[in-house]
């Protein structure tokens, strides 16, 4: 806290301008009126204050708005946002997407801070759902944003918002998150034709069930190995050799390089060696001829 001292004669600020950069911290505290600051917040970011001086300006706003800043002030905080704590932000009611964008811009180049996470949480809760415009904005600033949400939070994403999702936005999503997102994506892209549909749905396929993979195998999609390796193991295991061959098309040769990794390894163990041999890739580890193939649920019951 800066101690209360009288403002020196002639130093009382009549407006927020560049002369204030020469003020010491105690002079800013004594000579800048909080109400003046609040009405001229837009000027603060155009003035090269030190971050120590920003601390003083924040303190003045805190005194003026102990219950939380109004949005008219929040949207012009600029670099002062870096000085806010999550506790400060929890007092805010941010409804404008433009305000959100302005504050995210300030934090650009840094990972998502607790302050930013709190701001986004307040904003999304205020809106009731993660609409397309919001998702567009958030993933533009933080490509990993979607994957930072819990499956429960993702369940509030409307299918229409899925159009805003880019492949890189899903890079860090785990299977539980893709399980939630995939049905939404399927719904969102359902009216697209085969090849266009596959391009859009591809990033979400880590959440696809077996029957959808079987359906895709009938559509000449030529899935690449990187996508195949991200599929759910339990969804891949029931696929036949013929279905995998159709699903991968010319990329089927890549199975050899991945034969020791899941889900390929586990899938090989489920296939008849005769069937695997038809691929001509030298895949080994399938079920020898004459052996009984147990149903997967039966295997699990026995183990």
């Amino acid at each position: 806290e800066v101690e209360k001292t009288a403002c020196p004669s002639g130093k009382k600020a009549r407006e927020i301008d560049e002369s204030l950069i020469f003020y010491k911290k105690w002079e800013l505290e004594a000579c800048v009126d909080a109400a003046l600051l609040a009405t001229q917040m837009d000027r603060v970011n155009a003035i090269p204050f030190t971050y120590e001086q920003l601390d003083v300006l924040k303190h003045k706003l805190d005194e003026l708005y102990p219950q939380g800043y109004p949005e008219s002030v929040i949207q012009h905080l600029g670099y002062l946002f870096l000085k806010m704590s999550p506790e400060d932000i929890r007092k805010w009611n941010v409804t404008s997407l433009e305000t959100l964008k302005a504050l995210l811009e300030v934090n650009k180049g840094h990972e998502m801070s607790p302050q930013v996470a709190t701001l986004i949480d307040r904003f999304v809760k205020g809106r009731g759902q993660l609409d397309k415009d919001t998702l567009d904005t958030l993933t533009a600033f933080y490509p990993g944003y979607l994957c930072s949400l819990s499956p429960e939070e993702l369940s509030s994403v409307p299918p229409s918002s899925i159009w805003a999702v880019r492949p890189q936005d899903l890079d860090t999503c785990d299977p539980r998150q893709l399980d939630v997102l995939y049905p939404k994506a399927r719904l969102a892209f359902q009216n697209m034709n085969g090849s266009e549909y596959f391009v859009k749905i591809q990033s979400f396929l880590g959440g696809a069930p077996t029957e959808d993979l079987k359906a895709l195998s009938q559509q000449n999609v030529s899935m690449d190995l990187a996508t195949f390796m991200k599929l759910r193991t339990d969804a891949v295991l029931p696929l036949t050799v013929a279905e995998v061959q159709k699903l991968l098309g010319p990329h089927v040769e890549g199975l050899k390089a991945e034969e020791r990794h899941r889900p390929v390894r586990d899938w090989i163990l489920r296939q008849r060696q005769d069937d695997l041999d038809t691929l001509g890739l030298g895949l080994q580890g399938g079920i020898p001829n004459g052996y009984l193939v147990l149903d997967l649920s039966m295997q699990e019951a026995l183990s």
Epitope: I21, V44, N45, A46, I47, P48, F49, T50, Y51, E52, L54, D55, G78, Y79, L82, K83, H110, E111, S113, P114, Q115
Partner: antibody, heavy 125, light 112 residues
């Protein structure tokens, strides 16, 4: 008044690690208004910024490309200080090493307003 | 990296006479807010550098008013209106707008 007090050996053998410490008084190493920098000065390279550490909800480090593979700058909040480690030194690393406070200025530009006294480090066998 | 070029590299001045040092940047130091992010330092013999001028033209606390900075964009000048014996040392310009910060090679001021 901010003061920076440097300590560390003045002689380091080639291929070894140069280690210096900068003790801060009058400010906090965890302040989110400043960055804590290491800068060196030699006749051949002049003043050369090496890197910085700063806190903004979490710790960040930025390093000069010329030393990126060899440098580590660590804050020590318990002792209110920060350190420099430069690995695999050669005679070219012989210089006077300074720590400096870089107060952030809007937008996020450092202004080196306080400097340590400097430590001459000679790299020689 | 931004290259900072100073001239002259040395100058010898009679006490009471003016001195001028030029600094040129390989990239503009003018931010969209209208400020030039260029600082000047003086390193007196046997001492650490000390901040003289910041933001192109603003004197740091305790710096005598005989020192002034001017210029914009890529061309900057440090002027000493009347050189005094205590002004000897090496003067450096530094840009902080672009990472990494970079310094000029220095201008050595001597007294005649």
């Amino acid at each position: 008044q901010v003061q920076l007090q440097q300590s560390g050996p003045g002689l380091v053998k080639p291929s070894q690690t140069l280690s210096l410490t900068c003790a801060i008084s009058g400010d906090s190493v965890s302040s989110n208004s400043v960055a804590w920098n290491w800068i060196r000065q030699s006749p051949s390279r002049g003043l050369e910024w090496l890197g910085r550490t700063y806190y903004r909800s979490k710790w960040y480090n930025d390093y000069a490309v010329s030393v990126k593979s060899r440098i580590t700058i660590n804050p020590d909040t318990s002792k209110n200080q920060f350190s420099l480690q430069l690995n695999s030194v050669t005679p070219e690393d012989t210089a006077v090493y300074y720590c400096a406070r870089g107060i952030f200025v809007v937008p996020a530009v450092p202004r080196f307003d306080y400097w340590g006294q400097g430590t001459l480090v000679t790299v020689s066998s | 990296d931004i290259v900072m070029t100073q001239s002259p590299l040395s100058l010898s001045v009679t006490p009471g006479e003016p001195a001028s040092i030029s600094c040129r940047s390989s990239l503009s130091l003018l931010h969209s807010n209208g400020y030039n992010y260029l600082d000047w330092f003086l390193q007196k013999p046997g001492q650490s550098p000390q901040l003289l001028i910041y933001l192109g033209s603003n004197r740091a606390s305790g710096v005598p008013d005989r020192f002034s900075g001017s210029g914009s964009d890529t061309d900057f000048t440090l002027k000493i209106s009347r050189v005094e014996a205590e002004d000897v040392g090496v003067y450096y310009c530094m840009q902080g707008l672009h990472t990494p910060p970079s310094f000029g090679q220095g201008t050595k001021l001597e007294i005649k």
